[in-house]
């Protein structure tokens, strides 16, 4: 049985031009995380593979960076970043869980971050 | 010990398909992407593809998008590239080989030689 | 995309001798460079990866170098096994593209 929940940064908005910090989190298991990918929409960002370390996709190596931890800084942001990303934690034993974040990105300075909730 | 396992040499006509393996073995199969690259003679090596059998995702070079077409089996650890609509400018050997961040294409297969003639 | 330049498509050299293989990028490929040797017959076999980091098992009388746009793989003590083409890659972005090859000579 799955027991563990996803807290992410639930919905967030930044500048046009600037960066954001990407983060997930697994609790309330002890399963083992074996890997964690970043999907924007449908395309890949990046994987953290517990023993391979980073991959970052070659589409996005010039404005994504690894980190903090298992999260994702995209940086250099634009209108276009604006939606869905989804950050997808393989499990032993568990399986799989998703976090989904909301990224808005704004022309104007008045980007602020919303509150985090969490996917069970 | 780390090996990529490619199919034999294939003979096969002009307008045909035709569809190779690459079996993984030594490693896991799911953590690791595998590329298909085509070397001919005169004109060196070009990149197909990659696949990542861990969560198939998968990207092509543009110019042989509508020519090949790449899979990946992880219940038997093996990749296939098929080639449709084959001509004499298919002829070529094709190698798989892994890949993941730095190690970019680390351990190569021993090749598949195709060739179309009619 | 992005065009990588092997001026040397020949080089001949001497055993014991140290040669230079060149690589030039036509942008900024950071460090997502790989090289390869392939002997007449056999499939590629990686050197070095990440532009100056030799790969497991790799003689250390192979040393890459170079960052952005330049590269350089050196053989030092040249020796008759080293006799075969040699090719870089970049990984920076899709799609993946390869130098032309050096073919290294023995004297």
């Known amino acids: 049985m799955m027991t563990g929940t996803i807290e992410t940064t639930g919905n967030i908005s930044a500048e046009k031009g600037g960066s954001i910090i990407l983060q997930c989190h697994l609790s309330s298991t002890t399963a083992q995380v074996t890997q964690v990918n970043w999907e924007q929409q449908d395309q890949l960002l990046a994987i953290c593979n517990a023993d391979l370390g980073w991959h970052i996709s070659p589409s996005f190596k010039d404005r994504v960076a690894p980190g903090p931890g298992l999260g994702l800084t995209l940086q250099s942001l634009t209108v276009n970043d604006t939606g869905e990303y989804f950050c997808i934690y393989h499990t032993y034993p568990d399986g799989t869980y998703t976090g989904r974040i909301f990224l808005e990105v704004l022309e104007s300075s008045v980007a602020e971050h919303g509150a985090r909730f969490q996917i069970p | 010990q780390i090996q990529l396992q490619q199919s034999g040499a294939e003979l096969v006509r002009p307008g045909t398909s035709v569809k190779m393996s690459c079996k993984a073995v030594?490693?896991?199969?799911?953590?690791?992407?595998i590329n298909w690259v085509k070397q001919r003679p005169g004109h060196g090596f070009e990149w197909i593809g990659d696949?990542?059998?861990?969560?198939?995702?998968?990207n092509y070079n543009e110019k042989f998008k509508g020519k090949a077409t790449l899979t990946a089996d992880t219940s038997s650890s093996t990749a296939y590239m098929q080639l449709s609509s084959l001509t004499s400018e298919d002829s070529a050997i094709y190698y798989c080989?892994?890949?993941?961040?730095?190690?970019?294409?680390?351990?190569w297969g021993q090749g598949t030689s195709v060739t179309v003639s009619s | 995309d992005i065009v990588m330049t092997q001026s040397q498509k020949f080089m001949s050299t001497s055993v014991g001798d140290r040669v230079s293989i060149t690589c030039k990028a036509s942008?900024?490929?950071?460090?997502?460079v790989v090289w390869y040797q392939q002997k007449p017959g056999q499939s590629p076999k990686a050197l070095i990866f990440l532009a100056s980091n030799r790969h497991t098992g790799v003689p250390d009388r192979f040393t890459g170098s170079g960052s952005g746009t330049d590269f350089t793989l050196t053989i030092s003590n040249v020796q008759s096994e080293d006799l075969a083409d040699y090719f870089c890659?970049?990984?920076?972005?899709?799609?993946?593209?390869f130098g032309g090859g050096t073919k290294l000579e023995i004297k």
């Open positions: 030594g490693y896991t199969f799911t953590n690791y992407w």
């Open positions: 890659l970049q990984h920076w972005n899709y799609p993946y593209t």
């Open positions: 080989a892994r890949g993941y961040g730095s190690y970019a294409m680390d351990y």
């Open positions: 696949i990542y059998p861990g969560g198939y995702y998968i």
């Open positions: 942008q900024n490929v950071r460090t997502d």
